[in-house]
C-alpha cells in the first residue's frame, strides 16, 4: 500500500487552509461546504461544539461563545500589551490563569476555559478531518505554518496545538517561506535571490523579505500591521451601505445586529466580486423593517472607500526594505499571499511601487501558503518524485457540472476550468410538502437553464420522510477524480440514505468538438446581454473616471501645481457626476457616455496641462480619453443569511 501522505496546514488568523501533495501535484482540499478555506472559528453552544463555517455562520447569534483570533493569543502572556489591546475588541471573554490567557465560554450549560493552544488544536483537528475525508485514510503527519515574526514561544505553542490535534508536526515553517516554496523560488538555480512576500489576509498584513540561496531561506526583515486586512475593507463597505440605506430609506440599520450581519455577508461577497468585475450587485430581501435592499457598487467607488487603507500597505513595504538594508531594485521576486491581494488596486499600488515589476500571483493567494506547506511536507516525508521539484500543470474541467433545480435552472457545483481532481458539496432541499424523493439530473454546460445544457445522467433518491418543503437536507457531492470520472452522490441527511451515479468520459460525455461548440454557443447567447453589459460598462467607466479625477486633483503631490480655480472646477463637476450617478443608476448607455464626455471636457485640459512635459499622460496612466471602463456587470451577490 502506498505510504500515507503528509499534509500542509496554513493556520490563519481568520481562515485556515489544508493541502496535500500526491500524484505529482498539490491539491488544496475543500471542506464539507465545498470551501477551500475554513474559518478559524470555534463555537460552543448548549448542545454542541462547532468548528469552521458552522461556527462562523452563527457568530451573530452566539457572540460570547464563538472564539476566533486564537492566533493573536497563542504563545503570549496575559499581560502582553497585544493581548490587552486585542481583548477590548473581542465579544468573548479572556481570563488570566497564571499569566496565561484563557478563553472562557459557556458550553453545554457549564462555564469552560480553554487555552489558545486548545482552540487552535480544534481548528487543526478540523483541517485534519477535512484532509482525511478527502484522502480516505487517517492522517498524522503535517507541516504547519506560522508568521515569520512568531517567537519561539509562539512556535512551540503552535506545535503543541498540533500535538493536541493528534498530529505529528514534521516542522513549523514560516508563512512567507511556504509561499516562496509554492512558487519554486528555491529552485531557480540563479544564486542568491531577494524575495518580498506581501501577505494581506483577512485580519492581518505581513511583509517579509527573504533571501534564498541554494535552498536555504533566511528572513531578512518583517513588517506589517497586525490589524489590517479584508475585514477592514468589509467594514468600509458596510458603513457605505448603511449610509446609502439612510439616504434612500431614511432609516438607520446600524443598531440592528441581524441586518448588519446580513449586510456584512453581502459586502464580503461584493468585495470578492469586485476583484474580478468592475461592478457588484447586492440583493438583500427584507433587510430592515421589510425593506428590500437592492443596490450595487463599482470597483472605483470601493477603491475610493478604502483608498487610505490600500495606500497604507506600502509603509510596511518601505520599512521592511529599510530593515533589510535593500533598495527596491534589489528585490528579485514579489509574491502575493492572502485573499485581499486579489484586489486589483492593491496589486497596482505594489506593482507601481516596484516600477512595474511582475507579481507572482498564479497560485490562489489564499492557498499559496498551504500549497508550499504541502510541498514541504512531501519533501520531509521523503517524496523523491521529480514533481516535487517540477510541479505539473493542473488538469481542468472543460465545462461546468451541476444539477437541475426548481424551474429547470442549472445549478453548477463545479465551475468550468476548475482544476481536477476536485470535490464540491452543496445542500439542496425539497420543492413540495411531503415530497417523497428527489430526481438528481446531472448536466454539463454554461447555459443558465438545463434545457440548453447536456444531460449526463440522472438518478432518484427516494424514501425521504414526510416533511414540509424546504426542511429535508439533501447533500449532493460532485467528485471528479484525476481521470475525469465524475461521481455524483445524494444523501438524505436525516436518514443517511444515499444514492449515486458514476459518469465516465465515454458515457454521454461531450467530445472536444462539442465542448468547443457549447462554449461558442454560450458566447453567442451572452451577446444577447450585450446591451445591458454595455450600459453597465459605460456606467462603470463614468464612475471610475469621476473618482479617478477626484483623487487626482486631491493628490497632495499636486499642491501648487494646480490652481484653486481649476481644482474647484474639477471637483464641482466630479461631485455633480457622482451625485447624478447615485440618482441615475438605471440610466441608458448614451446618458452615461454623455456625462463621461462632459466630465472629460472639463478635466482633460486641466489634468493634461499638469503633466505636459512630464513624460506621461497623467495619473494612473489615463490618456485623453480616460479609462474606458471594465468588463461589464459583475455577478450578482445573492443573499446568504
Amino acid at each position: 500500500m502506498a505510504k500515507a501522505a503528509a499534509i500542509g496546514i496554513d493556520l490563519g488568523t481568520t481562515y485556515s487552509c489544508v493541502g496535500v501533495f500526491q500524484h505529482g501535484k498539490v491539491e488544496i482540499i475543500a471542506n464539507d461546504q465545498g470551501n477551500r478555506t475554513t474559518p478559524s472559528y470555534v463555537a460552543f453552544t448548549d448542545t454542541e461544539r462547532l468548528i469552521g463555517d458552522a461556527a462562523k455562520n452563527q457568530v451573530a447569534l452566539n457572540p460570547q461563545n464563538t472564539v476566533f483570533d486564537a492566533k493573536r493569543l497563542i504563545g503570549r502572556k496575559f499581560g502582553d500589551p497585544v493581548v490587552q489591546s486585542d481583548m477590548k475588541h473581542w465579544p468573548f471573554q479572556v481570563i488570566n490563569d497564571g499569566d496565561k490567557p484563557k478563553v472562557q465560554v459557556s458550553y453545554k450549560g457549564e462555564t469552560k476555559a480553554f487555552y489558545p493552544e486548545e482552540i487552535s488544536s480544534m481548528v487543526l483537528t478540523k483541517m485534519k478531518e477535512i484532509a482525511e475525508a478527502y484522502l480516505g485514510y487517517p492522517v498524522t503527519n503535517a507541516v504547519i505554518t506560522v508568521p515569520a515574526y512568531f517567537n519561539d514561544s509562539q512556535r512551540q505553542a503552535t506545535k503543541d496545538a498540533g500535538v493536541i490535534a493528534g498530529l505529528n508536526v514534521l516542522r513549523i515553517i514560516n508563512e512567507p517561506t511556504a509561499a516562496a516554496i509554492a512558487y519554486g523560488l528555491d529552485r531557480t538555480g540563479k544564486g542568491e535571490r531577494n524575495v518580498l512576500i506581501f501577505d494581506l489576509g483577512g485580519g492581518t498584513f505581513d511583509v517579509s523579505i527573504l533571501t534564498i540561496d541554494d535552498g536555504i531561506f533566511e528572513v531578512k526583515a518583517t513588517a506589517g500591521d497586525t490589524h489590517l486586512g479584508g475585514e477592514d475593507f468589509d467594514n468600509r463597505l458596510v458603513n457605505h451601505f448603511v449610509e446609502e440605506f439612510k439616504r434612500k430609506h431614511k432609516k438607520d440599520i446600524s443598531q440592528n445586529k441581524r441586518a448588519v450581519r446580513r449586510l456584512r455577508t453581502a459586502c464580503e461577497r461584493a468585495k470578492r466580486t469586485l476583484s474580478s468585475s468592475t461592478q457588484a450587485s447586492l440583493e438583500i430581501d427584507s433587510l430592515f423593517e421589510g425593506i428590500d435592499f437592492y443596490t450595487s457598487i463599482t470597483r472605483a467607488r470601493f477603491e475610493e472607500l478604502c483608498s487610505d487603507l490600500f495606500r497604507s500597505t506600502l509603509e510596511p513595504v518601505e520599512k521592511a526594505l529599510r530593515d533589510a538594508k535593500l533598495d527596491k531594485a534589489q528585490i528579485h521576486d514579489l509574491v502575493l499571499v492572502g485573499g485581499s491581494t486579489r484586489i486589483p488596486k492593491v496589486q497596482k499600488l505594489l506593482q507601481d511601487f516596484f516600477n512595474g515589476r511582475d507579481l507572482n500571483k498564479s497560485i490562489n493567494p489564499d492557498e499559496a501558503v498551504a500549497y508550499g506547506a504541502a510541498v514541504q511536507a512531501a519533501i520531509l516525508m521523503g517524496d523523491k518524485s521529480e514533481n516535487v521539484q517540477d510541479l505539473l500543470l493542473l488538469d481542468v474541467a472543460p465545462l461546468s457540472l451541476g444539477l437541475e433545480t426548481a424551474g429547470g435552472v442549472m445549478t453548477a457545483l463545479i465551475k468550468r476550468n476548475s482544476t481536477i481532481p476536485t470535490k464540491q458539496t452543496q445542500i439542496f432541499t425539497t420543492y413540495s410538502d411531503n415530497q417523497p424523493g428527489v430526481l438528481i439530473q446531472v448536466y454539463e454546460g454554461e447555459r443558465a437553464m438545463t434545457k440548453d445544457n447536456n444531460l449526463l445522467g440522472r438518478f432518484e433518491l427516494s424514501g425521504i420522510p414526510p416533511a414540509p418543503r424546504g426542511v429535508p437536507q439533501i447533500e449532493v457531492t460532485f467528485d471528479i477524480d484525476a481521470n475525469g470520472i465524475l461521481n455524483v452522490t445524494a444523501t438524505d441527511k436525516s436518514t443517511g440514505k444515499a444514492n449515486k451515479i458514476t459518469i465516465t468520459n465515454d458515457k454521454g460525455r461531450l467530445s472536444k468538438e462539442e465542448i468547443e461548440r457549447m462554449v461558442q454557443e454560450a458566447e453567442k447567447y451572452k451577446a444577447e446581454d450585450e446591451v445591458q453589459r454595455e450600459r453597465v460598462s459605460a456606467k462603470n467607466a463614468l464612475e471610475s473616471y469621476a473618482f479617478n479625477m477626484k483623487s487626482a486633483v486631491e493628490d497632495e503631490g499636486l499642491k501648487g501645481k494646480i490652481s484653486e480655480a481649476d481644482k474647484k472646477k474639477v471637483l464641482d463637476k466630479c461631485q455633480e457626476v457622482i451625485s447624478w450617478l447615485d440618482a441615475n443608476t438605471l440610466a441608458e448607455k448614451d446618458e452615461f457616455e454623455h456625462k463621461r464626455k462632459e466630465l472629460e471636457q472639463v478635466c482633460n485640459p486641466i489634468i493634461s496641462g499638469l503633466y505636459q512635459g512630464a513624460g506621461g499622460p497623467g495619473p494612473g496612466g489615463f490618456g485623453a480619453q480616460g479609462p474606458k471602463g471594465g468588463s461589464g456587470s459583475g455577478p450578482t451577490i445573492e443573499e446568504v443569511d
Epitope: D572, Q575, E576, I578, S579, W580, D582, A583, N584, A587, D590, E591, H594, K595, K597, E598, E600, Q601, N604, P605, A624, Q625
Partner: antibody
Framework: QIQLVQSGPEVKKPGASVKVSCKAS????????MNWVRQAPGQGLEWMGW????????TYGDDFKGRFTFTTDTSTSTAYMELRSLRSDDTAVYFC?????????WGQGTLVTVSS | EIVLTQSPDSLAVSLGERATINCKSS????????????LAWYQQKAGQSPKLLIY???TRESGVPDRFSGSGSGTDFTLTIDRLQAEDVAVYYC????????FGGGTKVEIK
C-alpha cells in the same frame, strides 16, 4: 472677444451632403464642448448633439444618429457638422454653440436649404 | 428622454408689466449632491441666434438685465420678466442639461 463664425448658406439637392463649419476664436478651443442645434423654418430649437473638442468624441441626440457626423480640427479651432443623404425636411438653420455651464456663445447660424 | 413642456405657447403683456413663462419637466432636474437644478433659459429674437439668459435655474448670465429672473425646483420652473420692455419681444426656450440636453417648445412673448 469670443466669437463663433459659421460658414455661409448652402443650397443642396436631396441625396447630397453638406458640411457646415464653425470657427472659434477668443478662447482655448479644446477647453469647451461644441454643441449643434437645428431650427427648422418657423419651429423651435432642437438639440442635435455635441462634440468633446479635447478628445474628438461626438455625442448624437436620438433623432440625429446615422446621417450626422461631428468633427473638429483643433489646429484651426474649427468644428464641423456634416449631414449626408439630405432630405427636404433637413431644411433648417444649423447653429453651433459653445458649452460651459450652458450654451453661452452661439454662431450666427447656417441656413441649409434642400430642394430639387 | 426628458421632455420639457412650456406654457403658454404665446403671451401678450403690456409694456412695464410682468411676463411669466412656465417650463415643466417630465422628471426632476435636481442634483441632490450639488443642490442645483440643471435648467437654463434662452432668448431668441427674430432672425437672430439664441442668447443665454439664465443657467442652473436662477443664475443670471453676465450682462443679462436683472429684470430677468428664474425660479423653481425639481420639475416645475418659471422665467419671470419684470417691467417688460420692447426689446424683450422674443421667443423664450427652456433647456435641461440634467441628462443629455433637451429644449422646450418655446414661448412667444409679444407686446399687448
Amino acid at each position: 472677444q469670443i466669437q463663433l463664425v459659421q460658414s455661409g448658406p448652402e443650397v443642396k439637392k436631396p441625396g447630397a451632403s453638406v458640411k457646415v463649419s464653425c470657427k472659434a476664436s477668443g478662447y482655448t478651443f479644446t477647453n469647451y464642448g461644441m454643441n449643434w442645434v437645428r431650427q427648422a423654418p418657423g419651429q423651435g430649437l432642437e438639440w442635435m448633439g455635441w462634440i468633446n473638442t479635447y478628445t474628438g468624441e461626438p455625442t448624437y441626440g436620438d433623432d440625429f444618429k446615422g446621417r450626422f457626423t461631428f468633427t473638429t480640427d483643433t489646429s484651426t479651432s474649427t468644428a464641423y457638422m456634416e449631414l449626408r443623404s439630405l432630405r427636404s425636411d433637413d431644411t433648417a438653420v444649423y447653429f453651433c454653440g459653445r458649452y460651459d455651464h450652458a450654451m453661452d456663445y452661439w454662431g450666427q447660424g447656417t441656413l441649409v436649404t434642400v430642394s430639387s | 428622454e426628458i421632455v420639457l413642456t412650456q406654457s403658454p405657447d404665446s403671451l401678450a403683456v403690456s409694456l412695464g408689466e410682468r411676463a411669466t413663462i412656465n417650463c415643466k419637466s417630465s422628471q426632476s432636474l435636481l442634483n441632490s449632491g450639488t443642490r442645483k437644478n440643471y435648467l437654463a433659459w434662452y432668448q431668441q429674437k427674430a432672425g437672430q441666434s439664441p442668447k443665454l439668459l439664465i443657467y442652473w435655474t436662477s443664475t443670471r448670465e453676465s450682462g443679462v438685465p436683472d429684470r430677468f429672473s428664474g425660479s423653481g425646483s425639481g420639475t416645475d420652473f418659471t422665467l419671470t420678466i419684470d417691467r417688460l420692455q420692447a426689446e424683450d419681444v422674443a421667443v423664450y426656450y427652456c433647456k435641461q442639461s440634467y441628462t443629455l440636453y433637451t429644449f422646450g417648445g418655446g414661448t412667444k412673448v409679444e407686446i399687448k
